[in-house]
C-alpha cells in the first residue's frame, strides 16, 4: 500500500540522487535530534500528496533561525518549480492545523522513503 506524488526534476542532478540526498539529510535530522527541533516550532500541516514539495517548503520556510533545517529548506527549493517565500499559504495546507517541526520532518521522511522505494523520481 503506497501513496505517490511527483515533483519537478532539480536541474542537472539526477532526480534519484537528489531525492536520496534529501532523505539522508532528513535521517540525519531525526537521528541527531536532542533538544526539541527548532525549539518546538509549529508549522502548517499538509492534506494532499500532489505538489507536496512546494507545500512542504512553504511550511518549513516560515521557520527562521533554525540551522538544523536550513539545508532541508535549500534542498526542497530545488524540487519546487516556483519561488517560495515566507508567508505563502498553499491550498495543500490544512488551515488552522499546525504540527511540530519535528513531526513534520519525520513524516516528510516517511513519505519520501515511499516515493524512493516506488521509483517516483520525477
Amino acid at each position: 500500500l503506497t501513496c505517490l506524488g511527483g515533483f519537478a526534476s532539480p536541474g542537472p542532478v539526477p532526480p534519484s540522487t537528489a531525492l536520496r540526498e534529501l532523505i539522508e539529510e532528513l535521517v540525519n535530522i531525526t537521528q541527531n535530534q536532542k533538544a526539541p527541533l527548532c525549539n518546538g516550532s509549529m508549522v502548517w500541516s499538509i492534506n494532499l500528496t500532489a505538489g507536496m514539495y512546494c507545500a512542504a517548503l512553504e511550511s518549513l520556510i516560515n521557520v527562521s533561525g533554525c540551522s538544523a533545517i536550513e539545508k532541508t529548506q535549500r534542498m526542497l527549493s530545488g524540487f519546487c518549480p516556483h519561488k517560495v517565500s515566507a508567508g505563502q499559504f498553499s491550498s495543500l495546507h490544512v488551515r488552522d492545523t499546525k504540527i511540530e517541526v519535528a513531526q513534520f520532518v519525520k513524516d516528510l521522511l516517511l513519505h519520501l522513503k515511499k516515493l524512493f522505494r516506488e521509483g517516483q523520481f520525477n
Epitope: 501513496c3 499538509i46 504540527i99
Partner: nanobody
Framework: GVQLLESGGGLVQPGGSLRLSCAAS????????MGWARQAPGKGLEWVSI????????YYADSVKGRFTISRDNSKNTLYLQMNSLRAEDTAVYYC???????????WGQGTLVTVSS
C-alpha cells in the same frame, strides 16, 4: 502530539449498521497508510481493514469482506469504517491506527466499543 480519536461505537442489533470515525491530529495524516484493528473479548488484536494514503488501495480481513468499507478524507484528517450486516462476532473494541512498516510510525487511538447484540 499525535492524537487519534475514535467515535461512532455503540450497541447495535445483528444485521444493523454503524459508521466509525477517527479524527487524526498532530501528524501529516495524508502521508500515512491507516487502518482499523479490533480486539474481541478474550481474543487477540486483528487488523480489520487498511487503506493507502491516497485512498486507492484497500485491504480487508476475510471475516469482514463485503460487509465493511474503509474510507478516508485527507482534507478533514479523518478515517472512516462503514460496518454493515453486523454480527455478534463483530463485537469488539475497534482501534484506529497508522499502518506503516517503518519503525517509529506506530500510532494508535484509545478505541471505541462496538457491541452487536439483540
Amino acid at each position: 502530539g499525535v492524537q487519534l480519536l475514535e467515535s461512532g461505537g455503540g450497541l447495535v442489533q445483528p444485521g444493523g449498521s454503524l459508521r466509525l470515525s477517527c479524527a487524526a491530529s498532530g501528524f501529516i495524516f495524508a502521508w500515512y497508510d491507516m487502518g482499523w484493528a479490533r480486539q474481541a473479548p478474550g481474543k487477540g488484536l486483528e487488523w480489520v481493514s487498511i487503506i493507502a494514503c491516497k485512498g486507492g488501495k484497500t485491504y480487508y480481513a476475510d471475516s469482514v469482506k463485503g460487509r465493511f468499507t474503509i474510507s478516508r478524507d485527507n482534507s478533514k484528517n479523518t478515517l472512516y469504517l462503514q460496518m454493515n450486516s453486523l454480527r455478534a462476532e463483530d463485537t469488539a473494541v475497534y482501534y484506529c491506527a497508522t499502518a506503516e512498516d517503518e519503525p517509529g510510525y506506530d500510532y494508535w487511538g484509545q478505541g471505541t466499543l462496538v457491541t452487536v447484540s439483540s
